[in-house]
Amino acid sequence: SGVFQLQLQEFINERGVLASGRPCEPGCRTFFRVCLKHFQAVVSPGPCTFGTVSTPVLGTNSFAVRDDSSGGGRNPLQLPFNFTWPGTFSLIIEAWHAPGDDLRPEALPPDALISKIAIQGSLAVGQNWLLDEQTSTLTRLRYSYRVICSDNYYGDNCSRLCKKRNDHFGHYVCQPDGNLSCLPGWTGEYCQQPICLSGCHEQNGYCSKPAECLCRPGWQGRLCNECIPHNGCRHGTCSTPWQCTCDEGWGGLFCDQDLNYCTHHSPCKNGATCSNSGQRSYTCTCRPGYTGVDCELELSECDSNPCRNGGSCKDQEDGYHCLCPPGYYGLHCEHSTLSCADSPCFNGGSCRERNQGANYACECPPNFTGSNCEKKVDRCTSNPCANGGQCLNRGPSRMCRCRPGFTGTYCELHVSDCARNPCAHGGTCHDLENGLMCTCPAGFSGRRCEVRTSIDACASSPCFNRATCYTDLSTDTFVCNCPYGFVGSRCEFPVGLPPSFPW
């Protein structure tokens, strides 16, 4: 469906004559009849298959026709059609003289025709006007024309119906070619599918209107990307809904059993950091200067011989300090103020000057090293100590300081943690994969059975005859204070009656 529009612009009839050559009296009062029809190679009379339209009297003899579309007038002339525009047409425009007010064909004399033009050709649908001018011996007509689609019709031949909508059945406007253009926030073939909140999880979230994110069961959060753990889960998380994966230090079905050995037992000494590594096991990360399973052993930072050029090392609370020999300075006595003239090379090292004597380099004999050949070659560089043992240079030799649980020249032998009898007060020691555990006798507790927990020896009511019972805390035994008339360690004998001994 569309409209063929014809805009008449100018008609010239300077002599004011009819087609017959006869002049109009007093002038040619001119109106037009338009016939639009299917394409004909030779335009011939017959039905105006695409439509007809007539104008009122537009002027006399020669005149310009003003554009009257804005005022609701009839220029451009409208020839609507209710079919697919074929792309070709034939057009007949007749100019007639109106002697009176009746413009009906039957009311006009047959010789009232002023001029007749006929054109045919191709015409694509579009907004642009095609300008044309037709001239006969006596007249000239200038006009333009175009084909546009009716409202809600689109495409090359106005055959595509598209009506914008914003309701349950779609949310779109129409493009010039009749395709749908979804309103913001909608997608899909008919723009019925809302675009969810940006980032809304594809599987776990959905939406019923644009820019929202509704969560499916078991999911939550702004983007429905956080799972909800199993109901009752206390110290756990999930990667899929209703799981309960325990946080570090917690166990049990609902992650409500505390496995945080570090917090409850504080086993690490000397400011070390404690890390739980499973039920009842832990790892201590020692501060510099300490070693041992519980960081209970103090290291000398001077053991690594940090002072160069014969500097002597002094241990300090927060590290060490190098006392440099004359001619050296720096944190490790690494800077020299000497030259070869000062004979700075020890142990038979030979001196070579550098930078025009500004400084020097020592070439050391075997078994000595250091910038001044002041150090014996460190026998610890090959890391001879096994199982985390610490290598210490001791004069001409070396020794390994072993971690607890290891022994041997190179700490290569594994010692049972229980070998050093760590459990106090007769506790029973059990070797574990990550250490040891003490089973304490009655009256003692703690990791090493070092805590005395007093036993109430009177709890079993050992005293007879209403005697008062006292616990001896030093021996965890009881003492009975007998009432008058009774004796014996448990006040079991009346006074005057000798005990009956079995012998």
Epitope: C213, L214, Q220
Partner: nanobody
Framework: EVQLVESGGGLVQPGGSLRLSCAAS????????MSWVRQAPGKGPEWVSA????????YYADSVKGRFTISRDNAKNTLYLQMNNLKPEDTAVYSC????????????????WGQGTQVTVSS
């Protein structure tokens, strides 16, 4: 059975403060995001603030940003809303809720609501 019980509302002068509480039961409170919603007389529900399950992320409507603070105590199964510099337009019934869906500004669909507590700001 899920229960959300709000308290702490009342009459307060403009510029004053109130602290609302929401006691939760019947579900594992610490596993769920929570939200505060308000409804003024003759108006629809308006999202106020939200907090994630762990309490590390908080969200506020533009109308309350900088004046209200949401928090939670998972050990006590309680949600809080500290309201400072209150204005007459804050007058409403305030409810805590478990959000089920979010829009571009905040939660707008809820799995459960409490009955609410009335807050009136007037001189």
């Amino acid at each position: 059975e899920v229960q959300l019980v709000e308290s702490g509302g009342g009459l307060v002068q403009p510029g004053g403060s109130l602290r609302l509480s929401c006691a939760a039961s019947g579900f594992t409170f610490g596993s769920y995001d929570m939200s505060w919603v308000r409804q003024a007389p003759g108006k629809g529900p308006e999202w106020v603030s939200a907090i994630n399950s762990g309490g590390g992320s908080t969200y506020y409507a533009d109308s309350v940003k900088g004046r209200f603070t949401i928090s939670r105590d998972n050990a006590k199964n309680t949600l809080y809303l500290q309201m400072n510099n209150l204005k007459p337009e804050d007058t409403a019934v305030y409810s805590c809720a478990i959000p089920r869906g979010w829009g571009p500004t905040g939660p707008h669909e809820y799995a459960y609501w409490g009955q609410g507590t009335q807050v009136t700001v007037s001189s």
